[in-house]
Interface confidence: low
Amino acid sequence: ALPAKPENISCVYYYRKNLTCTWSPGKETSYTQYTVKRTYAFGEKHDNCTTNSSTSENRASCSFFLPRITIPDNYTIEVEAENGDGVIKSHMTYWRLENIAKTEPPKIFRVKPVLGIKRMIQIEWIKPELAPVSSDLKYTLRFRTVNSTSWMEVNFAKNRKDKNQTYNLTGLQPFTEYVIALRCAVKESKFWSDWSQEKMGMTEEEAPCGLELWRVLKPAEADGRRPVRLLWKKARGAPVLEKTLGYNIWYYPESNTNLTETMNTTNQQLELHLGGESFWVSMISYNSLGKSPVATLRIPAIQEKSFQCIEVMQACVAEDQLVVKWQSSALDVNTWMIEWFPDVDSEPTTLSWESVSQATNWTIQQDKLKPFWCYNISVYPMLHDKVGEPYSIQAYAKEGVPSEGPETKVENIGVKTVTITWKEIPKSERKGIICNYTIFYQAEGGKGFSKTVNSSILQYGLESLKRKTSYIVQVMASTSAGGTNGTSINFKTLSFSVFE
């Protein structure tokens, strides 16, 4: 049978390297040779390119090389397939070389801020060495912040006579490191170069862009004054590298703005001792370039009743995240403050906090929390300047098996009964929420038995034992990740009882 007609011919001119044409060969049953016929020099000349490979995938491509390729030019390309039964020709295809030229990528050599111009970086590059002198180049510049994965793109063109191979990328975040890549194409071409090597650059620093402010209210002291720990951090979306020289704080009783106190600090928290009434606290951060907008927080009076609206709350782990969800009875509350800290016996030193808006759930990457640590998580509803009653739960980002089993004792040994008691495992050793305990017991040389009880039970009575028999018993504490046995204890049931 005649060979299949070659279809889907496509040609690319790798500028100053070669012109490569490819096609779909069709299902060939016998050996087929392909010849690509070209006319060039605006139809004045013609030549052939013959595939000489025996592997079918390499036979669907053929290349013409320099010096017989120059831009601009018009080509016709036709592919002939030949086997023992005859020859079949493709359709004639027509190509303008400048429409199919593909260059090397440009080389970015410098990405820098322009001194004194905010939120901008200037990209300087070298045009590809092999690019048509007679054509303008078009460019796509793609950029992203260092810690982002999604690219933004901007397109522009450069005149071939333009010596200045620079582009000013504006509208960026201040004091932020960007990753830049550039590609180019002959203006008339549909083929883009590959992307250049990526280069980093940073925008200039600006005044801080803002703060988030929070507080921890402590019980009133004997003199009626109340310690309030103020906490603050850069506003969400602030440049990662944003530096602050210091903070300026001022506060006053809600009833009397004339009693304003001010202070400066370079720390990220501050302990205030306030009277029992309600207060307003305001603060700004500053650097050598200016001040941030003011952040303000209301501190309620000691006796002020806070509203309650969270009805139920639960935590679960899903896809490497700890997810906390809650239900609220107040539809007008749409901002919440989340506090979390490790549940350790000492005073919490590492309180973390974050606000959530327009949602009744909060997620945190598992790796931002220590595995096998219990965290206290509180959610505060916030309505305008009022902060509601928190709802608190405990959760683990990742559970493990307890690092030790329960400390076990045997009490009330009888003829056929015994009471097994055990202590709760210390918090630091639990590695997860204890969901149950399992009591394993076995008579010497006999069959083993087990009984599982829920985690609120710390003792269990074994019955129907054999009299005057040695038993071994141990208690296992389990989390969702598995269980750990306590030490095994031996006891012997009595031979008779005074009650028999």
């Epitope: 080389k107 050599f109 410098r110 820098k112 001194l115 004194g116 300087e124 070298i126």
Partner: antibody, heavy 121, light 107 residues
Framework: QVQLVQSGAEVKKPGASVKVSCKAS????????MNWVRQAPGQGLEWMGL????????SYNQQFQDRVTITADKSTSTAYMELSSLRSEDTAVYYC??????????????WGQGTLVTVSS | DIQMTQSPSSLSASVGDRVTITCQAS??????LAWYQQKPGKAPKLLIY???TEAQGVPSRFSGSGSGTDFTLTISSLQPEDFATYYC?????????FGGGTKVEIK
């Protein structure tokens, strides 16, 4: 023609500061970046930092970041380099050098005659 | 920071000799390299920039070559006034760094 004329030699005690000036003429002062480079006796060249006199923007070598301040006075076409907390190893000739930006960015096209700063107790 | 390594640190040559000094960058600096000449008690003088472009008024016996990380300064026929110390410097970005210098002395 383009000229950079620096202030005279200085002798300073350890811990003191020195301020070297560099007066430019023969070109538009605000159109070119000014660099400062130093050379300890018998040693090589060490770039300290630069200033864009047009807007006062600076860039410093990390090694000097905390001790060097480069400024420019547009009205007198003069650049200044101040080095604080001087120590004996700061004994060197300090040069100002104009950037040849038209020909190649960061090439030091025109140099001052140098100012010898001696730090000695 | 980009490190610049120059070799040799010194060499002896006679008038009329062809002299070659090399400079290596610790990373790709394309063709952004300058060469300076410094005579005792004087400020350095720009000879070559962009690896091979001669600065204004520099005699044609001075030539530069190379790109990427390896560069060469060649003096085709050494003249009496060429005995000096030569420094390479990358002009790729700040911070600018110089090579350690090559002292060309009379043999």
């Amino acid at each position: 023609q383009v000229q950079l004329v620096q202030s005279g030699a200085e002798v300073k005690k350890p811990g003191a500061s020195v301020k070297v000036s560099c007066k430019a003429s023969g070109y538009t002062f605000t159109g070119y970046i000014m660099n400062w480079v130093r050379q300890a006796p018998g040693q090589g060249l060490e770039w300290m930092g630069l200033i864009n006199p047009y807007n006062g923007g600076t860039s410093y070598n990390q090694q000097f970041q905390d001790r060097v301040t480069i400024t420019a006075d547009k009205s007198t076409s003069t650049a200044y380099m101040e080095l604080s907390s001087l120590r004996s190893e700061d004994t060197a000739v300090y040069y100002c050098a104009r950037d040849g930006y038209d020909d190649g960015p960061y090439t030091l096209e025109t140099w001052g005659q140098g100012t010898l700063v001696t730090v000695s107790s | 920071d980009i490190q610049m390594t120059q070799s040799p640190s010194s060499l002896s040559a006679s008038v009329g000799d062809r002299v070659t000094i090399t400079c290596q960058a610790s990373e790709d600096i394309y063709s952004f390299l300058a060469w300076y000449q410094q005579k005792p008690g004087k400020a350095p003088k720009l000879l070559i920039y962009n690896a091979q472009t001669e600065a204004q008024g520099v005699p044609s016996r001075f030539s530069g070559s190379g790109s990427g990380t390896d560069f060469t300064l060649t003096i085709s026929s050494l003249q009496p006034e060429d005995f000096a110390t030569y420094y390479c410097q990358h002009h790729y970005d700040s911070p600018l760094t110089f090579g350690g210098g090559t002292k060309v002395e009379i043999k």
